[in-house]
Interface confidence: medium
Amino acid sequence: MGLTSQLLPPLFFLLACAGNFVHGHKCDITLQEIIKTLNSLTEQKTLCTELTVTDIFAASKNTTEKETFCRAATVLRQFYSHHEKDTRCLGATAQQFHRHKQLIRFLKRLDRNLWGLAGLNSCPVKEANQSTLENFLERLKTIMREKYSKCSS
């Protein structure tokens, strides 16, 4: 009984890894983490999810996947760098303050994972088009889900 319970976690881990290997290396833990983070981010509004960001998806026809991820990360970094201490976003209640702190924490995690997926040092973001942060995140979620469905099928 004790031996079985000791063997189960490594066995489960090996099976999970084998599953990932069969599906292809692109369907890695980072992608799952990104989707999980995006799900959390799009679940609830905060005072600042309607602030605008550069819409990199409006004209992304000649852009590689890696460039898209890199530019998305750049946009998110610009957003949280500018609005992390924005008094409007921090709000006036403990709940608003907590939700904003959570938003920033998720954006930073998303930024870090997108950089990892992109594997690029830098990328220009010059678009004039604007989108709200929440619409930007919804669009990114759609892209990531499509990518996941391709690599896991």
Epitope: T46, L51, T52
Partner: nanobody, 116 residues
């Protein structure tokens, strides 16, 4: 082109009330958070209040909490600021604001003077 036109400012005695309006055009008003910023004579810009598109979440600066009420009418593309119990320190030019990326876009402003 984004246009924000404020109105409703004027001279009022301490303790009095005013209602500011902001008519918005050139963008889908109902999709965006909007707010009010003010600039007192010789001072910097201060965020007064902010409201999300649905109107369910609002923010107020500590200096106006309990006295000012922000609201919006998405069917009329209009933002409001009801100001009660006005004080001399509320004297400022009030601007209606829409966020635009790392910059904020605001109108020409309306002057509110609180004096006896």
């Amino acid at each position: 082109e984004v246009q924000l036109l404020e109105s409703g400012g004027g001279l009022v005695q301490p303790g009095g009330s005013l209602r500011l309006s902001c008519a918005a055009s050139g963008f889908t008003f109902r999709n965006f958070g909007m707010g009010w910023v003010r600039q007192a004579p010789g001072k910097g810009l201060e965020w007064v209040s902010w409201i999300i598109s649905s109107g369910t979440e609002t923010y107020y600066a500590d200096s106006v909490k309990g006295r000012f009420t922000i609201s919006r009418d998405n069917s009329k593309n209009t933002l409001y600021l009801q100001m009660n119990s006005l004080r001399a320190e509320d004297t400022a030019v009030y601007y209606c604001a829409k966020s635009l990326g790392r910059f904020d876009y605001w109108g020409q402003g309306t002057l509110v003077t609180v004096s006896s």
